[in-house]
């Protein structure tokens, strides 16, 4: 509360995260036309990546291109992207929703369809809707510890969330343990009014702030967390400003002296830390 | 404007960031005496990483440094690093410029020059110009989508710069469409009084700046974001500072059983996103 | 100081960090049942990775689990984790410690001992103590440039760090040069009073605090940084929250058509710069 | 790395029929699209015909109906069946791949006599 003869100071932040889960995957795989069961285990080195501490992100679902190689081929034929001749391919173009850089020509893309010709890496990514329900969709079991250590510099002033005298298996829980900085994912949706499942098909961002309201007058000190949990990114955006989270990243191989790569388009949940409050002293 | 009755609170900030665009990097290649022409493509898992929300990295340069191998070899012959004698290598010292660690002896380099011997990856890295003009300067034609959710908690408050109304296919205009929030990175620069295609080949920082100065009291109600730009690293910076913006990064492998990597220096844009403003509320 | 008449305005700051140094690594390797020296040679591309601006890592001290291949396996026998019938294994069970889901099978580890089979990345990695001493500890010489450029928006102020008149062979030292902004990994340490060599065996995290506390009226301008350290992580941390600062990834490879991986546990000191003060005017 | 030779290249009446091969060796052709060029006296390279990974071709105008680019992944070879041959077809035709880099043959001659 307001103590208008204190001297208020803002805080200092600094986080540390550390998510711990195992999932499993099981989905059907066809090579060389037969189709298999795979069963793929996804830890911590899998799904998250040595991200700065104020945020952390967990895949929970992925649509892959695998074996893509550098050369030309007729891009995909999404909507809008059919050709009937050169005309329609301008050579050196680079459309925004395409994957390559256009060769001008039009070339044959199945039996029935025709694209423009790009330079790229090929076959092109298809445009697949993400796997639905999420690949990861376990990972609502997941738990993040969230180390926080704060400092108000003018005022002398050094703490961090976790007492010694906290207990390593706890788990967050707004009122039987709403000092405990472990969190389980699923929780930390359903405190935000969101439902899990849903948002790891497409992801999205969610927010865990961390306010500190510190009296650092020594007869009524008072300076610990309190946690509060809101989804950042827009669940109604238009289809066109990229709805969710996802990225794309790579994995690079040769293979027969070809470089080649895997493209994964990750979904997951990009978590933000946000920390703010003051310090006031007389 | 400053209104003395309202309560001030600072902004809390979530940031996500979409880039957009492929870049053909064509170069001349020689190889077992015969010169090809190589057509490389970069999009977004190329040339951009996984980066947190409140920046973003754009290469624009490379020089790599192609089957390295830890083994021992003579330094690279930058200047003051050539030698006569094993008296001037110093067993297990490490020249912060060099790239190993010396073994004690001078050794030929090539026919005319001696260095001294290296624990190192090797062959050590060449001291190359960056390349001029910037392999990837057509990322001059980049856009990148910035969304951004802010909250003022004591206000109870919370928006975001995009509205259901914004179209999808805008461009950021100073003065035709400033409200728009996908931007080109060539006009970011142009903004910032700045040449991209310079930028482009030794890197550098640029600050896209968000400010919001919020009044929300229903009888003024207004908050709506102001862009600006700025180039955050010094381009007068001497030479002993690392002007500009690089940093090396490797692919590893195996070839016949032998860990090799490709060592790359990535030259590039480091887009920072400032988000700064208040909201105030009688 | 507080001079109560001057309007008072928050930092804009954006940070760059450029890490140089190179350690050697000697470790008896075995393979095929022959002990051999082994010296690895680590420089930035292989010990620090792209981070953002306001944090950058050093890795120090790591452990490997080589060519691991998802399959079924005997989990690792950790304290708790034998069994001795399937009646102690629960199948779709994912043990927080453990690497894998359980199949509900108790079968034999080794001669001696018999742990729950799990579907994991086999062979699961090992619970071995972080090497001591520290395998990087030779990081204590690294140094690190730190560029600060700041922004008081308000009063259309922009300074940095680095100012022309600097020499770039300087390195930080409280009283003889405290406003070169080059610091030695170990004399960072020295200042927050710790010990390099003891922190990056498990790795911790290091504050360096920048403090501008600017005056920015033309009769009694200043403006300089103030630099300090101090440790971030809880050195006396309980077990159960995980003490010192590490993280995992993995480098994927396909050998004889089969897809690996090297998970690496990397330990090492991650260092965040926290920068505040205000700028003041009439 | 990969090195393409064509043969099958002649001196053929109008009306008659060539089948050009291109051996490639150094990385299997499955992975990239080949191609042939033709370069006639005095004129620009211009390309013929060309097969992607997953099978389809294109062809220029004037050769559609009359000529047939395959693969023989296995061979590790690329054919160009040339049916119904016109003078206009005389050139000299260059096997193409493009993997990262354009990897060219020597070039094989095909005449068209009248």
């Known amino acids: 509360s307001d103590k208008l003869y204190q001297r208020k100071e803002p805080v200092i932040s600094s986080v540390h995260t550390k998510v711990k889960g195992i999932a499993e995957v099981t989905e059907n795989v066809t090579e060389g036309g037969v189709t298999k069961l795979g069963h793929s285990i996804f830890d911590t080195a899998d799904y998250t990546f040595p991200l700065q501490g104020n945020s952390f992100f967990v895949m929970t679902n992925y649509v892959k291109s695998e074996g893509q190689v550098q050369t030309l081929c007729p891009e995909y034929p999404r909507r809008g992207a059919q050709c009937s001749s050169d005309r329609r391919c301008k050579k050196g173009w680079m459309d925004p929703q395409s994957k390559g850089i256009q060769t001008g020509r039009c070339v044959p893309y199945d039996k029935t369809r025709k694209t423009c010709e790009v330079s790229a890496w090929c076959p092109t990514e298809e445009e697949k809707e993400a796997p639905r329900p999420a690949l990861l969709r376990s990972a609502e079991n997941f738990t993040v510890l969230i180390k926080n250590n704060i400092h108000f510099p003018g005022h002398n002033y050094t703490t961090r969330n976790i007492l010694p005298t906290m207990n390593g298996s706890c788990t967050f829980h707004k009122t039987w343990d709403p000092q405990c900085s472990i969190f389980r994912l699923g929780d930390i949706f359903q405190e935000a009014g969101e439902n899990f499942t849903e948002v790891a098909v497409q992801g999205g961002i969610m927010g865990i702030e961390i306010y500190w309201d510190c009296n650092l007058d020594s007869w009524s000190h008072h300076c610990r967390p309190r946690y509060s949990f809101r989804r950042l990114d827009d669940k109604n955006m238009d289809e066109s400003f990229v709805p969710g989270y996802n990225f794309r990243y790579a994995k690079y191989y040769k293979e027969n002296n070809v470089e080649k790569r895997t493209l994964i388009k990750a979904f997951g949940i990009r978590f933000d830390i946000l920390v703010f409050g003051t310090g006031g002293k007389f | 404007s400053d209104k003395l009755y309202q309560r001030k609170e600072p902004v809390i900030s979530s940031v996500h960031t979409k880039v957009k665009g492929i870049a053909e990097v064509t170069e001349n290649v020689t190889e077992g005496g015969v010169t090809k022409l190589g057509h490389s493509i970069f999009d977004t898992a190329d040339y951009t990483f996984p980066l947190q929300g409140n920046s973003f990295f754009v290469m624009t340069n490379y020089v790599k440094s192609e089957g390295q191998v830890q083994t021992l070899c003579p330094e690279y012959p930058r200047r003051g690093a050539q030698c006569s004698s094993d008296r001037r290598c110093k067993k297990g010292w490490m020249d912060p410029q060099s790239k190993g660690i010396q073994t004690g002896r001078c050794v030929p380099y090539d026919k005319t020059r001696k260095t001294c011997e290296v624990s190192a990856w090797c062959p050590t890295e060449e001291e190359k110009e960056a390349p001029r003009p910037a392999l990837l300067r057509s990322a001059e034609n980049f856009t990148v989508l910035i969304k951004n959710n802010i909250h003022f908690p004591g206000h109870n408050y919370t928006t975001r710069n995009i509205l259901p109304t914004m179209n999808g296919s805008c461009t950021f205009h100073k003065t035709w469409d400033p409200q728009c929030s996908i931007f080109r990175l060539g006009d970011i620069f142009q903004e910032a009084g700045e040449n991209f295609t310079e930028v482009a080949v030794q890197g550098g920082i640029m600050g896209i700046e968000i400010y919001w100065d919020c009044n929300l009291d229903s009888w003024s109600h207004h908050c709506r974001p102001r862009y600006s730009f700025r180039r955050l690293d010094d381009k007068n910076m001497d030479e002993s500072f690392v002007p500009g913006y690089n940093f090396r990064y490797a692919k590893y492998y195996k070839e016949n059983n032998v860990e090799k990597r490709t060592l790359i220096k990535a030259f590039g844009i480091r887009f920072d996103i400032l988000v700064f403003g208040t909201g105030g509320k009688f | 100081s507080d001079k109560l008449y001057q309007r008072k305005e928050p930092v804009i700051s954006s940070v760059h960090t450029k890490v140089k140094g190179i350690a050697e690594v000697t470790e008896n390797v075995t393979e095929g049942g022959v002990t051999k020296l082994g010296h690895s040679i680590f420089d930035t591309a292989d010990y620090t990775f792209p981070l953002q601006g306001n944090s950058f890592f050093v890795m120090t001290n790591y452990v490997k689990s080589e060519g691991q291949v998802q399959t079924l396996c005997p989990e690792y026998p950790r304290r708790g984790a034998q069994c001795s019938s399937d009646r102690r294994c629960k199948k779709g069970w994912m043990d927080p410690q453990s690497k894998g889901i359980q199949t509900g099978r108790c079968v034999p580890y080794d001669k001696t001992r018999k742990t729950c089979e799990v579907s994991a990345w086999c062979p699961t990695e090992e619970e071995k103590e972080a090497p001591r001493p520290a395998l990087l500890r030779s990081a204590e010489n690294f140094t690190v440039l730190i560029k600060n450029n700041i922004h008081f928006p308000g009063h259309n102020y922009t300074t940095r760090n680095i100012l022309p008149t600097m020499n770039g062979s300087c390195t930080f030292h409280k009283t003889w040069d405290p406003q070169c902004s080059i610091f030695r990994l170990g004399d960072i340490f020295q200042e927050a009073g710790e010990n390099f060599t003891e922190v990056a065996v498990q790795g911790g995290i290091m504050g360096i605090e920048i403090y501008w506390d600017c005056n920015l009226d033309s009769w009694s301008h200043h403006c300089r940084p103030r630099y300090s350290f101090r440790r971030l992580d809880d050195k006396n941390m309980d077990e159960s929250f995980v003490p010192g600062y590490n993280f995992r990834y993995a480098k994927y490879y396909k050998e004889n058509n089969v897809e690996k991986r090297t998970l690496i546990k990397a330990f090492g000191i991650r260092f965040d710069i926290l920068v505040f003060g205000t700028g003041g005017k009439f | 790395k990969v090195q393409l030779v064509e043969s099958g290249g002649g001196l053929v009446q109008a009306g008659g029929s060539l089948r050009l091969s291109c051996a490639a060796s150094?990385?299997?052709?499955?992975?990239?699209?080949m191609g042939w060029y033709r370069q006639a006296p005095g004129k620009p390279r211009e390309l013929v015909a060309r097969i992607y990974t997953g099978g389809t071709a294109w062809y220029e105008d004037s050769v559609k109906g009359r000529f047939t680019i395959s693969r023989d992944n296995a061979q590790n070879t690329v054919y160009l069946q040339m049916n119904s041959l016109k003078s206009e077809d005389t050139a000299v035709y260059y096997c193409h791949g493009r993997v990262r880099y354009d990897y060219w043959g020597q070039g094989t001659q095909v005449t068209v006599s009248s």
């Open positions: 150094g990385s299997p052709i499955s992975s990239y699209a």
